[in-house]
């Protein structure tokens, strides 16, 4: 009877190890096809919508990279509480599986648009480097479904690159105009969306727990209106020490206020960037290593 | 450690309205949805519907919008579901839950007898 | 509304069993499928989201798999602690959905 039990034991361990390696196997050979998948999508052109049908649904793009997908692109998402999926650039290099949510890139997008563009979103999403703004709505589904990072890549004229991460990036619903509330900051392009740099700025120039702006709707906390004045829409205060959303000026400018694409603690108020790009990814991110 | 405490058991007469709770601790509380799900003695669960603490925004389950109401109270991190009109068929464990893609809190329920 | 069928109420099983409970959905809900267990005057416990991945601290012995309709929880080596009432769910789309349940019992 023991021996029997032994056997059993041995031969559990047996279908066991069978198992792991035929759920190996497995991995290995959807990966390999999603591979070739991905290669035929990939024309190699400026133009990087990648279609997957109706396969499976997905909720970000780092449900699509750890699925197998590692090419960047254009893919459908559909977050928890959206009524329906849209387009999305997933950004599967610096780690992989980032939702890019919004881009600039060269000046061909108008961004000083209104209330109802910036909520549903607006741009490019066709082309590997088109401009965008993914929609307020989008960007609350995103955000409450998980915790996110939010990584900001930051580009100037004379070639240099910084970046700024913030944990647990959420964006509010319609109902409190999409208040912006961010965690703590990493980087090297300085903390300008805290407002940490200065103490005494902080409380006008801190873009936490502000709400979103547009032209036709003023929720800063300025006389005047700011998103009128910067001529974009973004989380104002009085109004702000970074503006990703604002005129697309080569480098150095002037103006009449420092409407231009701003990040404070890297460039000051009066050197608009030559690229951006806001994505995020969950702060638990782990990828899926075949 | 995310928590949901919520209130105690109730016995209440048909027709009356009862208000439940269900305390958060351990996050920010605005900044996630809670639902509320229904499970009557030895049954599955229903989905009645949830509310963004962040502004109050709430959505139903069609078969709950006349008999579910729901609010909170931020300044105490509390979700609170009022239920009216009830009758035997409400007589149930009544659940909140922060549900995210990859995680899932519950409440620990609240029993609700509805009885004359 | 996405209804989840778990056509079996009630399992008979054995310590060390392979046990394999199903759920399917009456539409494509891709892989965006939740797995709870749940025993008497207890809340439902979150074993397996997004249809094949198992929640921190849940034993290896639990596998989730499928997508689209059709989903499966396995138990690869039953233990007396694993008696329970196991739900699927669906959020795919709201409202949430789940399954009616399938209680595994002993033989």
């Known amino acids: 009877l023991e021996d029997c039990a032994q056997e059993q034991m041995r031969l559990r361990a047996q279908v066991r190890l069978l198992e792991t390696r035929v759920k190996q196997q497995q991995v290995k050979i959807k990966q390999l096809l999603q591979e070739n998948e991905v290669q035929f999508l990939d024309k190699g052109d400026e133009n990087t919508v990648i279609d997957l049908g109706s396969k499976r649904q997905y909720a970000d793009c780092s449900e699509i990279f750890n699925d197998g997908y590692k090419l960047s692109g254009f893919y459908k998402i559909k977050p928890l509480q959206s009524p329906a999926e849209f387009s999305v650039y997933c950004d599967m290099s610096d780690g992989g599986g980032w939702t890019v949510i919004q881009r600039r890139s060269d000046g061909s997008e108008n961004f000083n648009r209104g209330w109802k563009d910036y909520e549903n979103g607006f741009g490019n999403f066709v082309q590997k480097h088109g401009e965008y703004w993914l929609g307020n709505k989008n960007l609350h589904f995103l955000t409450t479904q998980e915790d996110y990072t939010l990584k900001i890549d930051l580009a100037d004229f004379e070639k240099n690159s910084r970046y700024a991460q913030y944990k647990n990036f959420k964006v509010g619903d319609e109902k409190n105009f999409y208040e912006l509330n961010i965690g703590e900051y990493s980087g090297t392009a300085g903390d300008s969306l805290a407002g940490n740099f200065h103490p005494e700025v902080q409380w006008w120039a801190s873009h936490q727990r502000m709400k979103f702006s547009t032209w036709d709707r003023d929720h800063d906390n300025y006389e005047g209106n700011c998103a009128e004045e910067d001529q974009s829409g973004w989380w104002f205060n009085r109004c702000h020490s970074a503006n990703l959303n604002g005129v697309y000026y080569s480098g150095p400018y002037t103006a009449k206020t420092d409407n231009g694409i701003v990040w404070y603690t890297w460039h000051g108020w009066w050197y608009s960037l030559k690229s951006v790009v806001m994505k995020i990814r969950p702060n638990d991110f782990i990828p899926n290593v075949i | 450690e995310v928590q949901l405490q919520q209130s105690g058991p109730e016995l209440v007469k048909p027709g009356a309205s009862v208000k439940i709770s269900c305390k958060a601790s351990g996050y920010t509380f605005t900044d996630y949805y809670i639902n509320w799900v229904k499970q009557k003695p030895g049954q599955g669960l229903e989905w009645i519907g949830w509310?963004?603490?962040?502004?109050?925004?709430?959505d139903h389950n069609e078969k709950f919008k006349d008999k579910a109401t729901l609010t909170v109270d931020t300044s105490s991190s509390t979700a609170y579901m009022q239920l009216s009109s009830l009758t035997s068929e409400d007589t149930a464990v009544y659940f909140c839950?922060?549900?995210?893609?990859?995680?899932?809190?519950w409440g620990q329920g609240t029993l609700v007898t509805v009885s004359a | 509304d996405i209804v989840m069928t778990q056509s079996q109420k009630f399992m008979s099983t054995s310590v060390g069993d392979r046990v394999s409970i199903t759920c399917k959905a009456s539409q494509n809900v891709g892989t965006a499928v939740a797995w709870y267990q749940q025993k008497p005057g207890q809340s439902p416990k979150l074993l397996i989201y997004s249809a094949s991945n198992r929640y921190t601290g849940v034993p290896d012995r639990f596998t989730g798999s499928g997508s689209g309709t059709d989903f499966t929880l396995t138990i690869s080596n039953m233990q007396s602690e694993d008696l329970a009432d196991y739900f699927c769910q669906q959020y795919s789309s709201y409202p949430l959905t789940f399954g009616a349940g399938t209680k595994l019992e002993l033989k």
């Open positions: 839950l922060r549900f995210l893609l990859r995680s899932a809190y």
């Open positions: 509310i963004y603490p962040g502004s109050g925004n709430t």
